[in-house]
């Protein structure tokens, strides 16, 4: 496939990536699937600069990112290494809280109203951000 050189309509370009900001809410798994169907992934935050960019666009609203620990270890959806990567948890987070009474702990990460991260119940219908890299080969077949 050919390399994508510009962002799709309604996506925002920033530092060689394209971002799409939802205005409705979905459970984390549904948001993850939505991004995949767009040949993208839930946003992976790799720097303070990217954190500020996303934070500016989402405002003070709980918003899913591509980070979860549903299988135990914290994992970014694109394979970026959690251990060595950027982190911006709220103080006292993540806490895998069980007190919500919905079953299980808290396995999915989201931006909170101040931009810092919290782990929460993955079924909560939060907004989400999709990201795709501009230099990633698109899935469209080459023209013959």
């Amino acid at each position: 496939g050919s390399e994508r050189t510009c962002c799709p309509v309604n996506w925002v370009e920033h530092e060689r990536s394209c971002y799409w900001f939802s205005r409705s809410g979905k459970a984390w798994a549904d948001a993850d699937n939505y991004c995949r169907l767009e040949d993208a992934h839930l946003v992976v935050v790799t720097s303070w600069e990217e954190q500020k960019f996303v934070q500016h666009h989402i405002g003070p609203v709980n918003t899913w990112m591509g980070l979860h620990d549903q299988n135990g270890p914290w994992k970014w959806v694109d394979g970026t290494d959690y251990e060595t990567g950027f982190k911006n948890w709220r103080p006292e987070q993540p806490d895998d809280w069980y007190g919500h009474g919905l079953g299980g702990g808290e396995d999915c990460a989201h931006f909170t109203d101040d931009g810092r991260w919290n782990d929460d119940v993955c079924q909560r219908p939060y907004r989400w951000v999709c990201e795709t890299e501009l230099d990633k080969a698109s899935q469209e077949p080459p023209l013959l």
Partner: antibody, heavy 114, light 107 residues
Framework: EVQLVESGGGLVQPGGSLRLSCAAS????????MNWVRQAPGKGLEWVSS????????YYADSVKGRFTISRDNAKNSLYLQMNSLRDEDTAVYYC???????WGQGTLVTVSS | DIQMTQSPSSLSASVGDRVTITCRAS??????LAWFQQKPGKAPKSLIV???SLQSGVPSKFSGSGSGTDFTLTISSLQPEDFATYYC?????????FGGGTKVEIK
């Protein structure tokens, strides 16, 4: 490589105390809940206690509540279990584990006997 | 507290056999179930979480299924290294509880 290494086990008399430690390495310790699980000789696994990554939430099995105290030092990447008023039935191998049990230490044997 | 009942408590099987172990919860635990393998003198090893998600590095001969109260662990073709004791554990709510274990022995 993720590693958990328990220490502090040994022989103690009924009513005595012991402090177990679990040294963690290879991961961001403060991002993970940690657990203590024990196994009496020839028996199955029994969950003992859990603590959230930043010390905000702690849970205990009824069998140890009021006698055992779980704690952690994120600066030292260490998990602890303070065991007081020990009973014969506390004799077991004690394991520390991470999150949903994705990794475990090798265990440390605690024997309560007079 | 949620009780976890595993069956059978032990079974004898031959190399190459398909083995199924069941775990029943006393109440709905969604898919918050893990399976562990333990060999004598060793620490437990995580095989499956979230009822059916295979842990990294675990061979695909292991599979898990179920939701709600009834769960199964299947070993598609038993190998010599698979003879061990298997435990289920619910993490839907505290206190966390384990099944009593299933010992898989050589026939």
């Amino acid at each position: 490589e993720v590693q958990l290494v328990e220490s502090g086990g040994g022989l103690v008399q009924p009513g005595g105390s012991l402090r177990l430690s679990c040294a963690a390495s290879g991961f961001t310790f403060s991002s993970y809940s940690m657990n203590w699980v024990r196994q009496a000789p020839g028996k199955g696994l029994e969950w003992v206690s859990s603590i959230s990554g930043r010390n905000t939430t702690i849970y205990y099995a009824d069998s140890v509540k009021g006698r055992f105290t779980i704690s952690r030092d994120n600066a030292k990447n260490s998990l602890y279990l303070q065991m007081n008023s020990l009973r014969d039935e506390d004799t077991a191998v004690y394991y520390c584990s991470r999150d949903r049990g994705s990794c475990w230490g090798q265990g440390t044997l605690v024997t309560v006997s007079s | 507290d949620i009780q976890m009942t595993q069956s059978p408590s032990s079974l004898s099987a031959s190399v190459g056999d398909r083995v199924t172990i069941t775990c029943r919860a006393s109440q709905d635990i969604n898919n918050y179930l893990a399976w562990f393998q333990q060999k004598p003198g060793k620490a437990p090893k995580s095989l499956i979480v979230a009822a059916s998600s295979l842990q990294s590095g675990v061979p695909s001969k292991f599979s898990g299924s179920g939701s709600g109260t009834d769960f199964t662990l299947t070993i598609s073709s038993l190998q010599p290294e698979d003879f061990a004791t298997y435990y289920c554990q619910q993490y839907n709510s505290y206190p966390l509880t384990f099944g009593g274990g299933t010992k898989v022995e050589i026939k």
